[in-house]
Interface confidence: medium
């Protein structure tokens, strides 16, 4: 049957119907990436602020990343959002630093609160930065007499604080 | 207490304008980035425009662009909308809200009423 | 312009029951930026879940959000009374901030 015939169509061709030879190659731009396909799927292009990883081939599709100052968002790269610095968030109006008592220490994300030392008991022994968390240290009770435990306030723009 | 407080919503007729007004209290305002979304009778929520917090950076939608205007008085702790041109449709309950950018609006305005009728 | 549209437009059940919303993005959102509102007539809306997952100060833990890319849900594991209202689903990934459509959550 033309069902059997077609099965017998590799990677990179396709089940062409209108022709006596039934196995036909995919056109350029296009590819299969497995046996039996009535059609051959177009090639994924990167263009704009993708740029190809992988070429399209006829059994396989491009693959592409994302041009400098920008990463891959989503399955296969299907998005490319903006690079930020350390110390930044991302929002909808671009880069923006982190608000005090948050840090980044990435090119992307989002700003976290710094650690609360005083919830596992522990002192600051580092303040944070916009770029780093803060490093806790020994519990108060460990350092020696006159030592100061500082505990960062919540993060200023955690929905539902109001910084005064 | 954050409180935000609008006003000067009213009748008025299509190409007529109006001014409203957000007062803000309880927080840092020129800290902030803000915004107002407005909802038309029995519809779901549409966002307007935004300012960034020194007044410097606006947005807006596409439905008003060109005929709204978005600012603040960062010494008065007050946001204002200006809309000149009004047409029928943007008959809405017009709300000011704290913007925290990635993460949404944490505190809303009770709304004001803007009626565009002849 | 990344369009949410939410399913479905009205949720009928009892108090006690479990409450699932679905809140679909026409492209990938990252899921920081996706938050989750509650309205009740003639109020305006409060903030329930922001980062697609947390939740905002004040909101009961019967409340939750999940999801990433393109598919976001709200659940409230049993309903009370006070629950009963419209959902917003809502995107600050890109301009034109945008909501859904809203779901009803009604009393069966």
């Known amino acids: 049957s033309l069902q059997d015939l077609c099965s017998n169509c590799p990677a990179g061709t396709f089940c062409d119907n209108n022709r006596s030879q039934i196995c036909s190659p995919c056109p350029p731009n296009s590819f299969s990436s497995a046996g039996g396909q009535r059609t051959c799927d177009i090639c994924r292009q990167c263009k704009g602020v993708f740029k190809t990883r992988k070429e399209c081939s006829s059994t396989s599709n491009a693959e592409c990343d994302c041009i400098s100052g920008y990463h891959c968002l989503g399955a296969e790269c299907s998005m490319c959002e903006q690079d930020c610095k350390q110390g930044q968030e991302l929002t909808k109006k671009g880069c923006k630093d982190c608000c005090f008592g948050t840090f980044n220490d990435q090119k992307r994300g989002i700003c976290r609160p710094w650690t609360n030392c005083s919830l596992d008991g522990k002192s600051v022994l580092v303040n944070g930065t916009k770029e780093r968390d803060v490093v806790c240290g020994p519990s108060p009770a460990d350092l020696s007499p006159g030592a100061s435990s500082a505990t960062p306030p919540a993060p200023a723009r955690e929905p539902g604080h109001s910084p005064q | 207490e954050v409180q935000l407080l609008e006003s000067g919503g009213g009748l008025v007729q299509p190409g007529g304008s109006l001014r409203l007004s957000c007062a803000a209290s309880?927080?840092?305002?020129?800290?902030?980035?803000m915004s107002w979304v407005r909802q038309a009778p029995g519809k779901g929520l549409e966002w307007v425009s935004d300012?960034?917090?020194?007044?410097?950076?606006?947005d807006y939608a596409d439905s008003v662009k060109g005929r709204f205007t978005i600012s603040r008085d960062n010494s008065k702790n007050t946001l204002y909308l200006q809309m000149n041109s009004l047409r029928a449709e943007d008959t809405a309950v017009y709300y000011c809200?704290?913007?925290?950018?990635?993460?949404?609006?944490?505190?809303w305005g009770q709304g004001t009423l803007v009626t565009v009728s002849s | 312009e990344i369009v949410l549209t939410q399913s479905p437009g009205t949720l009928s059940l009892s108090p006690g029951e479990r409450a699932t919303l679905s809140c679909r993005a026409s492209?990938?959102?990252?899921?920081?930026?996706l938050a989750w509102y509650q309205q009740k007539p003639g109020q305006a809306p409060r903030l329930l879940i922001y980062?697609?997952?947390s939740r905002a100060t004040g909101i009961p833990d019967r409340f939750s959000g999940s999801g990433s890319g393109t598919d976001f849900t709200l659940t409230i594991s049993r309903l009370e009374p006070e629950d009963f209202a419209v959902y917003y689903c809502?995107?600050?990934?890109?301009?034109?901030?945008?909501f859904g459509q809203g779901t009803k959550v009604e009393i069966k």
């Open positions: 809200a704290r913007d925290l950018m990635v993460y949404g609006f944490d505190y």
């Open positions: 300012i960034d917090p020194t007044g410097s950076k606006t």
């Open positions: 809502q995107q600050s990934y890109s301009y034109p901030v945008t």
């Open positions: 492209q990938s959102v990252s899921s920081s930026y």
């Open positions: 309880g927080f840092t305002f020129s800290s902030y980035d």
């Open positions: 980062g697609a997952s």
